[in-house]
């Protein structure tokens, strides 16, 4: 009996540019002889319904149809037919099929590969055209994929023990697609600093499928001047 097992749940998520290993394990009732078996990996794009051969291994012959694709013969002996793809790109997401032949038996398994890119986040202060005591803080999130993203603003006042979500005076622009397929978006918070308590911490909170925990960028209102420090104006921080 020949059986193939892929990633549990049927989906693998990998960061953009990562060296990804797409799992495929072979279960066979006898010891595997790699000279008399075959492995073929196929890929089906998210946009086209056409299957493309990525890699094949037959006895003493192996060929990568995608540059850098490899199945380790050494690991194959112990039943690991996982495919390694260096520098994975967004357009390489889709369905991967691992087909194993141990004559006369054949088994296969499929897995969905999702490629994600984590956003970078930075805060900027824009005082151009603003009234006195009015500031506009911009939270720029860039280089993320997929497009779905959630940006919120929160504040933590001195006296209260937990943050408060801000819903007023927040405008989040449309997402903009970059040349590389990733996305950018900017969210703006308008503050009347004269009405806010010094010591209040404001935070732009970015939630995205690529992040285990939200990305946070903050600034604190000071009594002297309600603004970001010079380093905060230009640096990325989370």
């Amino acid at each position: 009996d020949l059986k193939v097992e892929m990633m549990a749940g049927g989906t693998q998520i990998t960061p953009l540019n990562d060296n990804v290993t797409i799992f495929c394990n072979i279960f066979y009732s006898q010891p595997l002889n790699i000279t008399s078996m075959g492995i073929t990996w196929f890929w089906k794009s998210l946009t086209f319904d056409k299957e493309v051969k990525v890699f094949e291994f037959f006895g003493d012959h192996q060929e990568a149809f995608r540059p850098g694709a490899i199945v380790s013969p050494w690991r194959l002996k112990s039943g690991d037919a996982s495919l390694r793809l260096p520098g994975i790109q967004l357009e390489e997401a889709g369905e991967y099929r691992c087909e194993v032949v141990v004559t006369p038996l054949k088994a296969q398994g499929t897995v969905q590969l999702e490629v994600v890119a984590s956003p970078a986040s930075r805060l900027l202060l824009d005082q151009v055209g603003m009234k006195e005591n009015e500031d506009k803080y911009m939270c720029e999130s860039s280089g993320f994929y997929p497009e779905a993203i959630n940006i919120t603003w929160e504040k933590q006042t001195q006296k209260f023990p937990h943050p408060i979500e801000i819903s007023e005076d927040v405008i989040t622009g449309p997402t903009i697609k970059n040349m590389d397929g990733t996305f950018n978006v900017t969210s703006c918070l308008k503050l009347n600093s004269s009405q806010e308590d010094p010591g209040t911490v404001y935070q732009c909170v970015v939630r995205h499928a690529s992040l285990h925990t939200p990305l946070r960028s903050n600034f604190t209102l000071t009594a002297a001047r309600h603004s970001l420090s010079e380093t905060e104006k230009t640096d990325n921080f989370s």
Epitope: Q156, Q158, F160, P161, H162, E165, V201
Partner: antibody, heavy 117, light 107 residues
Framework: QVQLVQSGAEVKKPGASVKVSCKAS????????MNWMKQAPGQGLEWMGG????????DYNEKFKGRVTMTVDTSTSTVYMELSSLRSEDTAVYYC??????????WGQGTLVTVSS | DIQMTQSPSSLSASVGDRVTITCKAS??????VAWYQQKPGKAPKSLIY???NRYDGVPSRFSGSGSGTDFTLTISSLQPEDFTTYYC?????????FGAGTKLEIK
């Protein structure tokens, strides 16, 4: 990292006073507000009051007003909560706590005050 | 003062169960509600703020929902370490007030 270390357990007689301390470290002391909570044995949590750590502002729960005093010693980064005219229902664990800047609020380990004749 | 009425006061469940604890505020508190977990002899630990936002490091099995006067804390799949006491807290105004607590026990 932020630490709030409270003074040890106290046993007091009814009518006496108790002063519990909370020493803070790991952050700029004066730029925060410190709250005090009470938790009687097997009971829920109750806010007693709070103090701004530069010492210029306090806010007390009406229930404890007149009996509770909160003070600050900025030189030692220590906050004090004094409760006077103690009665048996004041037997509780007292906690100092401050906001956590997005990572959950910070709490001291608690101080058990037992009021018994 | 704003009263926070928490229910049930105790709850028996098994590992893997999904449980929901509710909290009702005596007046509109918006989303200014936090949830705490307290283990015996320890200080409370914040789980949720702004009714539904998990603090960093809090397992995803904990989720909060609600706004206005009705709030819930849900634990999607109970783990052995979750059997302890939970409190809700409003922080829209002083005095800060808490629910009376829900003790979660192993069935």
């Amino acid at each position: 990292q932020v630490q709030l270390v409270q003074s040890g357990a106290e046993v007091k007689k009814p009518g006496a006073s108790v002063k519990v301390s909370c020493k803070a470290s790991g952050y700029t002391f004066t730029s925060y507000w410190m709250n005090w909570m009470k938790q009687a044995p097997g009971q829920g949590l109750e806010w007693m009051g709070g103090i701004y750590l530069n010492g210029d502002s306090t806010d007390y729960n009406e229930k404890f007003k007149g009996r509770v005093t909160m003070t600050v010693d900025t030189s030692t980064s220590t906050v004090y909560m004094e409760l006077s005219s103690l009665r048996s229902e004041d037997t509780a664990v007292y906690y100092c706590t401050r906001r956590g800047d997005y990572f959950g609020d910070f709490w001291g380990q608690g101080t058990l005050v037992t009021v018994s004749s | 003062d704003i009263q926070m009425t928490q229910s049930p006061s105790s709850l028996s469940a098994s590992v893997g169960d999904r449980v929901t604890i509710t909290c009702k505020a005596s007046q509109n508190v918006g989303k200014y509600v936090a949830w705490y977990q307290q283990k015996p002899g320890k200080a409370p630990k914040s789980l949720i703020y702004s009714a539904s936002n998990r603090y960093d490091g809090v397992p995803s099995r904990f989720s909060g929902s609600g706004s206005g006067t009705d709030f819930t804390l849900t634990i999607s799949s109970l783990q052995p370490e979750d059997f302890t006491t939970y409190y809700c807290q409003q922080y829209i105004s002083y005095p800060l007030t808490f629910g009376a607590g829900t003790k979660l026990e192993i069935k």
